[in-house]
Each structure stands twice: as structure tokens, then as C-alpha cells.
């Protein structure tokens, strides 16, 4: 494995490319910070099925980020 020093991100690996929209309870976006140098998109699944990291480069993640940013600003 390539080893390098970085902050503690919440996700391990690149994340899933897509999640069924019907399964999504909530989407949270974590922007780059001192803790983690990349954007992370965390999906909370319905019916207590836990959480999944969505690949921030995926089409679905980009749509979610856009949607959240429009809502917030």
C-alpha cells in the first residue's frame, strides 16, 4: 500500500458509484478540512440499513452536491 500522512477521513476507499434513490434517507456532505483533504458524501440508508460513502466523483454524488449547495446558498 502507498503510505502517506493525512487527516482522518470518514470514508475508506473511493466509495460506491451509486445508491438507489428509493433507499436514501439522508445525504451529508463533508467538505475538505484539516481532518480530511477531500470531499466526502455520506448516504444514510432507510430502514436502519446503515451508511455508505458515495464516490464524490460519481454522477450521482455531483447531483447531490449541487442540490445541497443550491438549498444552502
Amino acid at each position: 500500500f502507498p503510505m502517506f500522512k493525512r487527516g482522518r477521513c470518514l470514508c475508506i476507499g473511493p466509495g460506491v458509484k451509486a445508491v438507489k434513490v428509493a433507499d436514501i434517507e439522508k445525504a451529508s456532505i463533508m467538505y475538505p478540512s484539516n481532518n480530511c483533504d477531500k470531499i466526502e458524501v455520506i448516504i444514510t440508508l432507510k430502514e436502519n440499513k446503515g451508511q455508505r460513502c458515495l464516490n464524490p466523483k460519481s454522477k450521482q454524488a455531483r447531483l447531490i452536491i449541487k442540490k445541497v449547495e443550491r438549498k444552502n446558498f
Epitope: F1, P2, L10, I12, G13, P14, I43, G50, Q51, C53
Partner: nanobody, 126 residues
Framework: EVQLVESGGGLVQAGGSLRLSCEAS????????IGWFRQAPGKEREGVSC????????YYADSVKGRFTISSDNAKNTVYLQMNSLKPEDTAVYYC???????????????????WGQGTQVTVSS
């Protein structure tokens, strides 16, 4: 079809070493986090080590820190678990498991993993 196949288990004396292999097929290796779990008779399955081959993250349960090392060979689609200074309490069936979109907070939860191997038995005698 996704498949994980473990090998390398066996009988070893306390203080000895073993290297387990987990060969993956049917998916893009870099997209997945692959972890090692173990289950001793009458006990729950517990996380031992976890990593992602794409970003170099490695994590260890406190019980194996400093003794076990996880590594991978992307060309061979294989993850290894090097186990040194083995103790009788390390006796268990060892499984590798793979998933996408894993969070650090849930990496020791077997329910977070989508695919599992059949397991390989490790027995450490005193």
C-alpha cells in the same frame, strides 16, 4: 460473479507465523475495501484488520496491533494478512470480506460487508 477465496491457514505453535491470502475476482479491486475477520468457536465474528487498496488506509484491532500486517498485490487481486507472534487466543476461522462505500465508524461491523470468503482455519497450539 464476486468471489473471495482465502488460503494459508494451518496449525502453528505459539510464537510462530502464518500468512493468509485472500484472492478476489469478479470486481474491480481498487473500488473495494477488504477486511479480515475471525470467528472462534462459540464467539462472535470480530474484525482483525481492514484496508482499502486504493488509498493506502490500514487499520488493526487492538488485540493484533504490532503483530499482524495487512498488505495487497493489486496485480494479483490479492490481500494478505501476515500474522506474527501468534498466540493460542488467535485460534479461529479467518475470513476476508469486501465492500464498497465503507465508513471507518462501521468497519468492524460484519454487516457492513457485502461479500465473504469461505474462511480458513488457524490453530495456534501452546
Amino acid at each position: 460473479e464476486v468471489q473471495l477465496v482465502e488460503s494459508g491457514g494451518g496449525l502453528v505453535q505459539a510464537g510462530g507465523s502464518l500468512r493468509l491470502s485472500c484472492e478476489a475476482s469478479g470486481f474491480t479491486f481498487d473500488d473495494y475495501a477488504i477486511g479480515w475477520f475471525r470467528q472462534a468457536p462459540g464467539k462472535e465474528r470480530e474484525g482483525v484488520s481492514c484496508c482499502s487498496s486504493s488509498d493506502g488506509s490500514t487499520y488493526y484491532a487492538d488485540s493484533v496491533k504490532g503483530r499482524f500486517t495487512i498488505s495487497s498485490d493489486n496485480a494479483k487481486n490479492t490481500v494478505y494478512l501476515q500474522m506474527n507472534s501468534l498466540k493460542p487466543e488467535d485460534t479461529a476461522v479467518y475470513y476476508c470480506a469486501a465492500t464498497q462505500g465503507l465508513l471507518i465508524a462501521t468497519m468492524w461491523n460484519p454487516a457492513s460487508y457485502d461479500y465473504w470468503g469461505q474462511g480458513t482455519q488457524v490453530t495456534v497450539s501452546s
